[in-house]
Interface confidence: medium
Amino acid sequence: GPAKSPYQLVLQHSRLRGRQHGPNVCAVQKVIGTNRKYFTNCKQWYQRKICGKSTVISYECCPGYEKVPGEKGCPAALPLSNLYETLGVVGSTTTQLYTDRTEKLRPEMEGPGSFTIFAPSNEAWASLPAEVLDSLVSNVNIELLNALRYHMVGRRVLTDELKHGMTLTSMYQNSNIQIHHYPNGIVTVNCARLLKADHHATNGVVHLIDKVISTITNNIQQIIEIEDTFETLRAAVAASGLNTMLEGNGQYTLLAPTNEAFEKIPSETLNRILGDPEALRDLLNNHILKSAMCAEAIVAGLSVETLEGTTLEVGCSGDMLTINGKAIISNKDILATNGVIHYIDELLIPDSAKTLFELAAESDVSTAIDLFRQAGLGNHLSGSERLTLLAPLNSVFKDGTPPIDAHTRNLLRNHIIKDQLASKYLYHGQTLETLGGKKLRVFVYRNSLCIENSCIAAHDKRGRYGTLFTMDRVLTPPMGTVMDVLKGDNRFSMLVAAIQSAGLTETLNREGVYTVFAPTNEAFRALPPRERSRLLGDAKELANILKYHIGDEILVSGGIGALVRLKSLQGDKLEVSLKNNVVSVNKEPVAEPDIMATNGVVHVITNVLQPPANRPQERGDELADSALEIFKQASAFSRASQRSVRLAPVYQKLLERMKH
């Protein structure tokens, strides 16, 4: 058969939950401390909560059935009677009473024809303000007749015909009634919830609803123009040109900020947005939903997309509607011909209307932002340049922040990219130019996206002119080739000599993408004499070992994930892993990762790696001539740097011998 409507699916679930109590029994959830009852869907059944409030399960006859004394469940179908009597069956006795008062209406309800009545419950009538009720029953009951006729449709309409966003023609001046049928099974009529649906009568059908409904005369724009509390919103809508949409056809939800909502925003923020047509349009579109959403439809958290594109979490807490967890809706379900308005007393500013400063203020990067400000870069972060800010997380600075000197200023300038980027469009090998004039490289890994040594730690926040990338560490732009990096650091004097001896200098100086695991002088010194002699005694062997320390792509620590097998220039693979924020290569910890170079990255290690296919062979402790040159250079370099190279006695003697 045809697909069941959401209402029918929920009813079916309630029937399923109630069947152990007999035929045609439905499980109903009642919110504790209220008279609010709901047929139950799967999620609510297990959570036992509606709008965050606890519920109790009771078991009632499903619509259209009744109990039979001495029998289990609700085996009997309700006897069919006319509409007037059916009002009594569904418990809408107040509607019966008012029908009697009109004199004209009861004969219609008892006579021939086919009608639908959306009958307000007794509680709905009782909750009407006294003055409203008085006005209905005065004027020779004509107002009452009109009101009741507005609750009626001149044909039989069952819930399976009640489609989301449809309008029905009422029997009062052919005025429209708005129907919404939500995915959670809730059906509303002018935002009043259907409590008991599809009660058949001989001449129609009765649906019990939880409110007295009234005619809708104004569109959203007209309501904004009428209400004093929307004075600022009115001006903003006019300035943005959105009034055409808000008075046109369609079904929207306007989360309408009151004057008070605008007053909560600092003047400078408000002036900036109001003076910027694009930001203003984004701000207003962030308060408009693409369809009408009545308060009664919200029984739990629901993600909705605004016209601006931001996702809002609409929820409820008891009787209060919430947006992003905050109870900021002060007046709900103001109906318009083209949708529904909820008054809100806090402005929902989308990222797209914010400066980089404002985006950063809502992220975990406040320490970095203070550094940018102190470094005199504030104007870039609040101006109209198209920029991307690479802002390290606060946790990066847990041990303190650097002093603001020329070096820090320059470093910070290299955290600002001269373009407004989106991470989803970045690609591996892309270069990005910074305000400091540096070119930064993009590395795309399986589970991370990195810019130089720093990886993106949170979703982008795209502002009016700037985008915020939250980064997992301070970014260090490359200062030279791998060879420059190694030569510029005293710890690597022996490695530099070894590279030169092995003829790899040119490789590590030219353009390329290398990951170098760089053993320190201590690593070389820690080698047993046998290993050292093997390593240094043969330039070809030395080149082989050194190539095993060089990966053929750039792998920064943020790109490792759990384990990466990195192919070395020697041919064998290096096992690079990350555990508890410590990088290891072949299970040996890296002392200092991520020293960036223009043609690669250097990771400092304190041991020399041995290729698996190249196990040490027994050798004498004689030192080959080719290797002596290495140590002569390394030793001289070390002395020049006021570091002594402590060599094993046999080498010391050989070096002494060389001097004579």
Epitope: I265, P266, E358, E362, R373, N379, S382
Partner: antibody, heavy 120, light 113 residues
Framework: QVQLVQSGAEVKKPGSSVKVSCKAS????????MYWVRQAPGQGLEWVGT????????YYAQKVQGRFTITRDSSTSTLYLELSSLRSEDTAVYYC?????????????WGQGTTVTVSS | DIVMTQSPLSLPVTPGEPASMSCRSS????????????LAWYLQKPGQSPQLLIY???TRESGVPDRFSGSGSGTDFTLKISRVEAEDVGVYYC?????????FGQGTKLEIK
């Protein structure tokens, strides 16, 4: 370094007008919000008005709205405050002030002040 | 308008001793979206223009000695001087930049005993 050099003292009669100037140097003038703050003799500080970085927006204290006008000339990096329909209660030292940056509104750098005396 | 109220109006202090002054606003200066307090402190030394000491309620302006510290949130703020020096005399003003019109407190006059 940042400098805000204001024009000299003025003595004026009630009902008359005067234009006070403030010459900025040591920073990109067009990148900053600028402010005027005044201090009546023996009294505290009172914000008079603000002009945006591009000179498009100006905001005034209610007391001076309609009588005072703030303008700026980016070509000469000069800020102006024109005081008209002067009253005796406008007697004060008027300070030219630079904001922190393009939007944020605290008063980072102050001029030396211009004394305006309104007396019959 | 947001009214700023400072206390005490006069604060005699012995050099080397700490000093503390208060500033209260008639409405909250904490902007929930960025959790920043839109409050600044200034010092006006005798015969001089005012100078900025603190912004965002607690961020010290560069060049301001670290004996000055700002604290507080919402409507109640405090400026503390850990050890007063002779050069600290003058009038201290708090100011809100949360909403136009920007307003100052009436000032606290710090003098040496």
């Amino acid at each position: 370094q940042v400098q805000l050099v204001q024009s000299g003292a003025e003595v004026k009669k009630p009902g008359s007008s005067v234009k006070v100037s403030c010459k900025a140097s040591g920073f990109t003038f067009s990148d900053y919000y600028m402010y005027w703050v005044r201090q009546a003799p023996g009294q505290g500080l009172e914000w008079v008005g603000t002009i945006s970085d591009g000179g498009i927006y100006a905001y005034y204290a209610q007391k001076v709205q309609g009588r005072f006008t703030i303008t700026r000339d980016s070509s000469t990096s000069t800020l102006y405050l024109e005081l008209s329909s002067l009253r005796s209660e406008d007697t004060a030292v008027y300070y030219c002030v630079r904001g922190w940056d393009r939007y944020d509104s605290w008063f980072a750098c102050w001029g030396q002040g211009t004394t305006v005396t309104v007396s019959s | 308008d947001i009214v700023m109220t400072q206390s005490p109006l006069s604060l005699p202090v012995t050099p080397g001793e700490p000093a503390s002054m208060s500033c209260r606003s008639s409405q909250s200066l904490l902007y929930s979206s960025n959790q920043k307090n839109y409050l600044a402190w200034y010092l006006q030394k005798p015969g001089q223009s005012p100078q900025l000491l603190i912004y965002w309620g607690s961020t010290r302006e560069s060049g301001v000695p670290d004996r000055f510290s700002g604290s507080g949130s919402g409507t109640d703020f405090t400026l503390k001087i850990s050890r007063v020096e002779a050069e600290d005399v003058g009038v201290y003003y708090c100011q809100q930049y949360y909403r136009y019109p920007y307003t100052f407190g009436q000032g606290t006059k710090l003098e040496i005993k």
